[in-house]
Structure formats: structure tokens, C-alpha cells
């Protein structure tokens, strides 16, 4: 079952070179 937190917006991942940025960091979709 999904954790309750998963339904909170924004949904974020930690990644490198994503989300129109060259650095690493959080990338979120709302």
C-alpha cells in the first residue's frame, strides 16, 4: 500500500541534471 505521504504535493525526486538544472537536487511536479 502507498504511504500517505505519497499523495502530498509536490511529488519530488532527488536527481542530477534534471528539471532544467545542471546540478543535483530536488525535482518536483505539482
Amino acid at each position: 500500500r502507498r504511504r500517505r505521504r505519497d499523495t502530498h504535493f509536490p511529488i519530488c525526486i532527488f536527481c542530477c541534471g534534471c528539471c532544467h538544472r545542471s546540478k543535483c537536487g530536488m525535482c518536483c511536479k505539482t
Epitope: F14, C15, C24, G25
Partner: antibody, heavy 115, light 110 residues
Framework: QIQLVQSGPELKKPGETVKISCKAS????????MNWVKQAPGKGLKWMGW????????TYADDFKGRFAFSLETSASTAYLQINNLKNEDTATYFC????????WGQGTLVTVSS | DIVLTQSPASLAVSLGQRATISCRAS??????????MHWYQQKPGQPPKLLIY???NLESGIPARFSGSGSRTDFTLTINPVEADDVATYYC????????FGQGTKVEIK
């Protein structure tokens, strides 16, 4: 539930190579990148970098460029950290950690480098 | 790099009292309307244990004695009341740009 299980402690001599593993379970391995963190004895936590588990592309923090290599065995949901030409200052506990809606950590692998 | 400065370095608290730990970031860790600051507890020989995520959210299974607050560059972890099991080192971590950690605050019982 999400789990990261790391390989056991290692005792190595200077100049040797060590490869430690981090096996993930409870989620789709390729959905979330894997980070590696170093903790020297009695010291704080230092981010070593990240590997994209979908493409296999590694990103290394400035202090960990050169002797350090991240790799994957995707079919086994396992990430690896290899350290070449070991030095005494590499003695530390190494953690894998991933962000999958929350931060999850492996139990740590102690690498001791001693002649 | 975003530098995190924790204070104090160590803290002696009486059982049942309040412990407050500060973490200051060299630049804002806010994005997307969230503060990407997290707090961990670490005991010897164990991995860090997540207590608080995104500045103020209590991780599942963590007692409500732990709370977090703050935004942008200034953050606080509060333990109230302190129990014997809380003896540990506490770290702040930001994930807005790379991953960086505070230097740690060691909490002991007075």
C-alpha cells in the same frame, strides 16, 4: 517495505581495491537514483555523489573524483561503490541512501584500510 | 556548495526538559514551496534515522516529542520532553542542491 542492505565489513591494505554493494528491495530500483555517503570514524556525514539507476550515469562530488566508481547491476537491484588505490584516509563507514518519497539508508559498510 | 552550520556542537539536557538544535544554511534550501531540510538521529554503529522531513513533517513511527520548524536558511529541531533514549548525535541535511549535512549536535543527559 523499502530496504537497502549493504555488504559486510572489509579490511584492506593501502593500494588495494574494495567494492561494496547495496541491494535494494521494496520498490522499483530504476525509479530512484542511489546516493553514497561517507562517514569517517567519529566524524560527520559527507555526500560522495549519485548514480542514475535508469541510465547508469554517475555524478561524483568534487572530493570523490578519480579513485571512486559507482556502478549498477540492475537485474539484481544492486548498486556498487568501488574505491581504487585505497588510502588510510578512506577508512570509514560508507552508506547508500535513496530518496523514494522519503530518505532510506543502508546499514553501512565499514571499510578499514591498514597496513 | 550549501554549507550547514549546526549549533550547539553538544548539548546536555535534563530528563523531561526541552532540547533545541539550530541549523543555519549558507543559502536558501527552499524550492517548489517546500523547505528541503531534514533532521536525523544517529546512534553509534547505526545508520542515520530520519526524524523530520521537509523542515516540519514528522516521519512515520517517530514520537511527537520531536518537532521541526523553519524555512529558507534557518531551521530548528526541538525535542520536548527529552527522554534517556534520545542520547545521540543529530544532523540536519539539505537536499535542495546536492546533499550536505550539518556537523552534528551531540545530545547527552545532564
Amino acid at each position: 517495505q523499502i530496504q537497502l542492505v549493504q555488504s559486510g565489513p572489509e579490511l584492506k591494505k593501502p593500494g588495494e581495491t574494495v567494492k561494496i554493494s547495496c541491494k535494494a528491495s521494496g520498490y522499483t530500483f530504476t525509479n530512484y537514483g542511489m546516493n553514497w555517503v561517507k562517514q569517517a570514524p567519529g566524524k560527520g556525514l559527507k555526500w560522495m555523489g549519485w548514480i542514475n539507476t535508469y541510465t547508469g550515469e554517475p555524478t561524483y562530488a568534487d572530493d570523490f573524483k578519480g579513485r571512486f566508481a559507482f556502478s549498477l547491476e540492475t537485474s539484481a537491484s544492486t548498486a556498487y561503490l568501488q574505491i581504487n588505490n585505497l588510502k588510510n584516509e578512506d577508512t570509514a563507514t560508507y552508506f547508500c541512501t535513496t530518496y523514494a518519497t522519503s530518505w532510506y539508508w543502508g546499514q553501512g559498510t565499514l571499510v578499514t584500510v591498514s597496513s | 556548495d550549501i554549507v550547514l552550520t549546526q549549533s550547539p556542537a553538544s548539548l546536555a539536557v535534563s530528563l523531561g526538559q526541552r532540547a533545541t538544535i539550530s541549523c543555519r544554511a549558507s543559502e536558501s534550501v527552499d524550492s517548489y514551496g517546500n523547505s528541503f531540510m531534514h533532521w536525523y538521529q544517529q546512534k553509534p554503529g547505526q545508520p542515520p534515522k530520519l526524524l523530520i522531513y521537509r523542515a516540519s513533517n514528522l516521519e512515520s513511527g517517530i514520537p511527537a516529542r520531536f518537532s521541526g520548524s523553519g524555512s529558507r536558511t534557518d531551521f530548528t529541531l526541538t525535542i520536548n520532553p527529552v527522554e534517556a533514549d534520545d542520547v545521540a548525535t543529530y544532523y540536519c541535511q539539505q537536499s535542495n542542491e546536492d546533499l550536505t549535512f550539518g556537523q552534528g549536535t551531540k545530545v547527552e543527559i545532564k
